[in-house]
Interface confidence: low
């Protein structure tokens, strides 16, 4: 058993049929010694008396808010949550496996630049009685600070018969060094509580591996005289790290016909312009990637040829 | 070539070669097996290789103030990785494929380190701890870790030389 926060405790249970459970001793936070009684949740049934209460926690029915009273007055509370371990593996019932980039991916994170700011998100089908708490650090044995905001519901989607809820959180490394080569990974820890079930999820990554630039901005076409060619130009996204002579991007320019089946013409360039042939009804798209480290490509920025 | 006593290196040549190193490091990576990139984020994984750290002067301001600190750090790292790629971690069992880019990568690391090394002036190079990869079962994992770290190292080096070529070239 360990304390999650003041008066909230997590009981770790090996979860198998007829498991013995965990013996837990609760102590009433009071100077009083006599006449103390204990109840669970809203029930008025007295579970025991005395300053301490010993319980065998085996299942969710044994979890909940234990309250000690004296003469009708509440003295203190202890909320017990359960953390299930099945076959040596902690349960992951609350969050949905996103399966990208691999199985058992519950948290996904992205950064738009090297500033030390990043966003993580996760999915669940649970709509109520759900709370999240996020902590992060750079490294784990001698952690350096990363400050995370509150997790918020960022999207709702319908998937077949189910509703899916996306939560996200923004974090910022306290003393980020954008130009340095990371040697210690960022660790992100999410505590999830659904009713009386506790679970925790972690992710470990280097910012460089989760970089995904915003799409190029100000994508423009300039027709070349007496030619089917156009000069495409664009700019670095505002959110990308500066100076651009140091934090350079590379670009992919694509000419795509109306039909998805049509052959795509692609050009790769380090410049912020390119000359391409603009076909009728086609569109021109440009996306960006870090020039020197193969993290994710941005989403496409597109303009029609006409 | 770089010249002794704090003169500028051949920024443009260094830029071209460092960008080539980035490409080679990424093309070499698939040859070390399908390990999970996200699971490599352990503190023990990369603490034995050189890193370009915050105080090494490789940020744009540091380069403007005195690029020598950063260039020496890059030089040390290049020598370190060149030795690693020439060690039995890469030359021993299990053998690399005959067309592996690791050979080219090794040669390019040496080329860039020589481009940075001033004539008649020897920077103190980083000593490599005794390597103990006599266990071939560890070599695949070591190659993976080294190439992953090298990708990150040469990315920073390439940024340094690109910025230098754009802003510090005579």
């Amino acid at each position: 058993i360990w304390e999650l926060k003041k008066d909230v405790y997590v009981v770790e249970l090996d979860w198998y049929p007829d498991a013995p459970g965990e013996m837990v001793v609760l102590t009433c936070d009071t100077p009083e010694e006599d006449g103390i009684t204990w109840t669970l949740d809203q029930s008025s049934e007295v579970l025991g008396s005395g300053k301490t209460l010993t319980i065998q926690v085996k299942e969710f029915g044994d979890a909940g808010q234990y309250t000690c009273h004296k003469g009708g007055e509440v003295l203190s509370h202890s909320l017990l949550l359960l953390h299930k371990k099945e076959d040596g593996i902690w349960s992951t019932d609350i969050l949905k496996d996103q399966k990208e980039p691999k199985n058992k991916t519950f948290l996904r994170c992205e950064a738009k630049n090297y500033s030390g700011r990043f966003t993580c998100w996760w999915l669940t089908t649970i709509s109520t009685d759900l709370t999240f708490s996020v902590k992060s650090s750079r490294g784990s044995s001698d952690p350096q600070g990363v400050t995370c905001g509150a997790a918020t519901l960022s999207a709702e989607r319908v998937r077949g018969d189910n509703k899916e809820y996306e939560y996200s959180v923004e974090c910022q490394e306290d003393s980020a060094c954008p130009a340095a080569e990371e040697s210690l990974p960022i660790e992100v820890m999410v505590d999830a509580v659904h009713k009386l079930k506790y679970e925790n999820y972690t992710s470990s990554f280097f910012i460089r591996d989760i970089i995904k630039p915003d799409p190029p901005k100000n994508l423009q076409l300039k027709p070349l005289k007496n030619s089917r060619q156009v000069e495409v130009s664009w700019e670095y996204p505002d959110t990308w790290s500066t100076p651009h002579s140091y934090f350079s991007l590379t670009f992919c320019v694509q000419v795509q016909g109306k039909s998805k089946r049509e052959k795509k013409d692609r050009v790769f360039t380090d410049k912020t312009s390119a000359t391409v042939i603009c076909r009728k009804n086609a569109s021109i798209s440009v996306r960006a990637q870090d020039r020197y480290y193969s993290s994710s490509w941005s989403e496409w920025a597109s303009v029609p040829c006409s | 070539r770089a010249v002794p006593g704090g003169s500028s290196p051949a920024w443009t040549q260094c830029q071209q070669l460092s960008q080539k190193l980035c490409t080679l490091a990424w093309s070499a990576h698939p040859l070390v097996g399908h390990m999970d990139l996200r699971e490599e984020g352990d503190e023990e994984t990369t603490n034995d290789v050189p890193h370009i750290q915050c105080g090494d002067g490789c940020d744009p301001q540091g380069l403007r103030d005195n690029s020598q600190f950063c260039l020496q750090r890059i030089h040390q790292g290049l020598i370190f990785y060149e030795k690693l790629l020439g060690s039995d971690i890469f030359t021993g069992e299990p053998s690399l494929l005959p067309d592996s880019p690791v050979g080219q990568l090794h040669a390019s690391l040496l080329g860039l380190s020589q481009l940075l090394q001033p004539e008649g002036h020897h920077w103190e190079t980083q000593q490599i701890p005794s390597l103990s990869p006599s266990q071939p079962w560890q070599r695949l994992l070591l190659r993976f870790k080294i190439l992953r770290s090298l990708q990150a190292f040469v990315a920073v080096a390439a940024r340094v030389f690109a910025h230098g070529a754009a802003t510090l070239s005579p």
Epitope: D87, G88 | E39, D42, G92, S95, P136, W137, L141, K145
Partner: antibody, heavy 120, light 113 residues
């Protein structure tokens, strides 16, 4: 199917050299490493050494000065030689392969074992 | 060398009851690279070679009954037989293949009470 079979004399005199052969079938020698492990009667298991897919060897430091492992790939055979034997070398000797060729580890297939007694 | 300490040395459990065997290596067997624990469990019956039950600390070898499970990480590992059957009487060994030389635990003899 995968098979490993140890063979060799069951009795060796003290100070002589113990020689055993492991004949394997059902898997590629290019992809799997072969190990020798022994077990004194009524005691635990002790790893002796390995011959890697490339032909190089590694031995338990406690036996290194006396052990030689070699192979004849044309016959799918591996041999173990242990010199200057004493009664303490009396054991069941097993050959085993490790599960993955390039990233070795645990032993998934074992031979039946052969008992070697060191006695004059 | 990594020393593998098994406990208990012997164990008597009633049929249908749970049997638990522990293995404590003298150093961590968790690979920082791929987060695998380089530990395997073997069962050995009299006159037979050891048989692989569990590898990478918790992965059951194909064909092994699901009453056998492995758990743990780093320097603390457990083999659990959830409901002991008569055919489970044997000596059980843990093996570390994290570092050369490979080393086994001293073995745990499992009997029926």
């Amino acid at each position: 199917q995968v098979q490993l079979q140890e063979s060799g004399p069951g009795l060796v005199k003290p100070s002589e050299t113990l020689s055993l052969t492991c004949t394997v079938s059902g898997f590629s020698l290019i992809s799997y490493n072969v190990h020798w492990i022994r077990q004194p009667p009524g005691k635990g298991l002790e790893w002796i050494g390995v011959i890697w897919t490339g032909g190089s060897t590694d031995y338990n430091p406690s036996l290194k000065s006396r052990v030689t492992i070699s192979r004849d790939t044309s016959k799918n055979q591996f041999s173990l030689k242990l010199s200057s034997v004493t009664a303490a070398d009396t054991a069941v000797y097993y050959c085993a392969r490790d599960k993955y060729g390039l990233f070795p580890g645990y032993f998934d297939y074992w031979g039946q074992g052969t008992l070697v007694t060191v006695s004059s | 060398d990594i020393v593998m300490t098994q406990s208990p040395d012997s164990l008597a459990v009633s049929l249908g009851e749970r049997a638990t065997i522990n293995c404590k290596p003298s150093q961590s067997l968790l690979s920082s690279g791929n987060r695998k624990n380089y530990l395997a469990w073997y069962q050995q019956k009299p006159g037979q070679p050891p048989k692989l039950l569990i590898y990478y600390a918790s992965t059951r070898q194909s064909g092994v009954p699901d009453r056998f499970s492995g758990s743990g990480s780093g320097t603390d590992f457990t083999l659990t037989i959830s409901s002991l059957q008569a055919e489970d009487v044997a000596v059980y060994y843990c093996l570390q293949h994290f570092n050369y030389p490979w080393t086994f635990g001293q073995g745990t003899k499992l009997e029926i009470k």
